[in-house]
């Protein structure tokens, strides 16, 4: 049966892939170049063995097919992951009246367990993404998205919120991560560095990409995000990153052309509605999966993570728009708004496809480190 | 599940002061937008003030210099101080709380009546 849809906003409103070579070993951070990645000041130490750096059916929809020639996370030279040299600066607003505990930051007081316990989980995200550590999961099918081309009206609010630009959806984005699996998309946000400084908040293999998106969703199971929280597979998050590419990718124009209206934190406008879908890569099959947490307080836990294999692609000038408009509080610019990546701690990640096999003429075997733990079955 | 309950409304002449309240329980409130809305009789649900988990606060038009919104995290409380009051604010007020994550509309209180008439 169909919850009812939440038909207001709250009261504060007034194919993207490229074409790219894959990444050679020059674009990795080098040993000499990038130190251990340590955790921003914000944020407690977690330990673990892995401290590695840097959801009513939804009708059948053809999920996107692969596009030739771009870049799969999977080509990824396997190095060393030094992780890399960058904190993510102090950005967090101040308010008026006075800190409080709930005014967290990126890299400074109060520690994020202050905030919320939650951060100094087990389970935490963002983590490192090692492809050959993966699990090869043949029952994790291509992800089905259903209503997620929008009509130019309503529009949408884009915010600056003082630690992201944030996108909320309308109700009706449905998607399925797998038979009973069904969600519906709340709100998407970027993640980003600052010049010459990727901000990614996952990595691969220690590579840190110039940004990421995050379209949250909350499970059919519940009708509030509240009741979600902390429940396995309550919510769940699509990832992807994002890349530069030679050509202007249009469908991030539509948000990014809109950036200097709310350079202002705490600033809002209104967006006409557009393809969420296109803001996505278009492989829906290739995809890393593993169980995580929201990554700024709360910090809640059960968070189903789904990290794309091909990239997105964005121009130098839109990735540079991207990092360079925005203002957080006291004159400090909004930049490096991304967690540190957090240990596994025996979680194993899981992948649709065989991202773990090295086909490599070296191997005379394909080599699969991990089984996969059937999730969905 | 978050509960919210208004009070402070009731009568007041025309130029006066009003001080709402709307107190929070069941649920985490430094991670939920806080919002004020009213309804006057024959006319649709608007607007009045909305302030985030952060302290970003924004207006109605038709209110902007009058009211000022804020909120106190350690009360689990939001304010909505109502200064210079007309007669064209008669209404229910009612507050509202959205989870950060979400961006809707997730609790509504059952509202405070404020009266304007000399």
């Known amino acids: 049966q169909r919850l009812p849809r939440m038909q207001e906003d709250s009261p504060l409103g007034g194919g993207s892939s490229g074409e790219d070579d894959p990444l050679g070993e020059e674009d990795l951070p080098s040993e000499e170049d990038s130190p251990r990645e340590e955790d921003p000041p914000g944020e407690e130490d977690l330990p673990g063995e892995e401290d590695l750096p840097g959801e009513e059916d939804l009708p059948e929809v053809k999920p996107k097919s692969e596009e030739e020639g771009s870049l799969k996370l999977e080509d990824l030279p396997t190095v060393e992951a030094p992780g890399d040299p960058q904190e993510p600066q102090n950005n967090a607003h101040r308010d008026k009246e006075g800190d409080d505990q709930s005014h967290w930051r990126y890299g400074g007081d109060p520690p994020w367990p202050r905030v919320s316990p939650a951060c100094a989980g087990r389970f935490q995200s963002p983590v490192d993404i090692r492809p050959q550590l993966a699990a090869f999961c043949p029952a994790l099918r291509p992800l089905e998205l259903l209503g997620f081309q929008l009509p130019p009206l309503p529009e949408l609010r884009l915010r600056n919120n003082g630690h992201s630009v944030q996108l909320t959806l309308p109700p009706g984005l449905e998607m399925a991560l797998g038979p009973g699996r069904e969600y519906r998309a709340l709100q998407l946000h970027l993640h980003w560095g600052a010049a010459g400084r990727p901000g990614s908040e996952h990595t691969v293999e220690g590579h840190r990409f110039p940004a990421e998106i995050h379209v949250v969703h909350l499970s059919t199971a519940f009708a509030r995000v509240d009741e979600a929280l902390g429940r396995p597979g309550g919510l769940a998050v699509l990832a992807a990153f994002l890349e530069e590419g030679p050509e202007e990718n249009s469908a991030y124009e539509q948000l990014l052309s809109r950036l200097e209206e709310i350079a202002e934190e705490g600033s809002e406008t209104q967006v006409p509605g557009l393809d969420i879908s296109a803001l996505l890569p278009s492989d829906f099959s290739r995809y890393f999966q593993y169980e995580g947490s929201l990554t700024t307080p709360p910090c809640a836990q059960g968070v189903i993570w789904t990290v794309f294999n091909q990239t997105v692609m964005l121009s130098a000038k839109q990735l540079h728009t991207l990092s360079d408009t925005l203002w957080g509080p006291g004159d400090s610019r909004l930049q490096l708004n991304f967690r540190a990546t957090q240990p596994l701690n025996g979680r194993v990640i899981e992948a649709s496809f065989p991202a773990g096999v090295d086909s490599s003429p070296r191997a005379a075997e394909p080599v699969q480190l991990n089984s996969c733990l059937a999730a969905g079955d | 599940q978050v509960q919210l309950q208004e009070s402070g409304g009731g009568l007041v002449q025309p130029g006066g002061s009003l001080r709402l309240s709307c107190a929070a329980s069941g649920g985490d409130f430094r991670f939920y937008d806080m919002g004020w809305y009213r309804q006057a009789p024959g006319k649709q649900r608007e607007l009045v003030a909305g302030i985030t988990t952060r302290g970003y606060t924004n207006y109605a038009d038709v209110v902007k210099g009058r009211f000022t919104i804020s909120r106190d995290n350690a009360k689990n409380t939001v304010y909505l101080e109502m200064n210079s009051l007309k007669p064209e604010d008669t209404a229910v007020y009612s507050c509202?709380?959205?989870?950060?994550?979400?961006?809707?509309?997730?609790?509504w209180g059952q509202g405070t009546q404020v009266t304007v008439s000399s």
């Open positions: 509202s709380a959205s989870h950060f994550l979400g961006g809707r509309i997730d609790y």
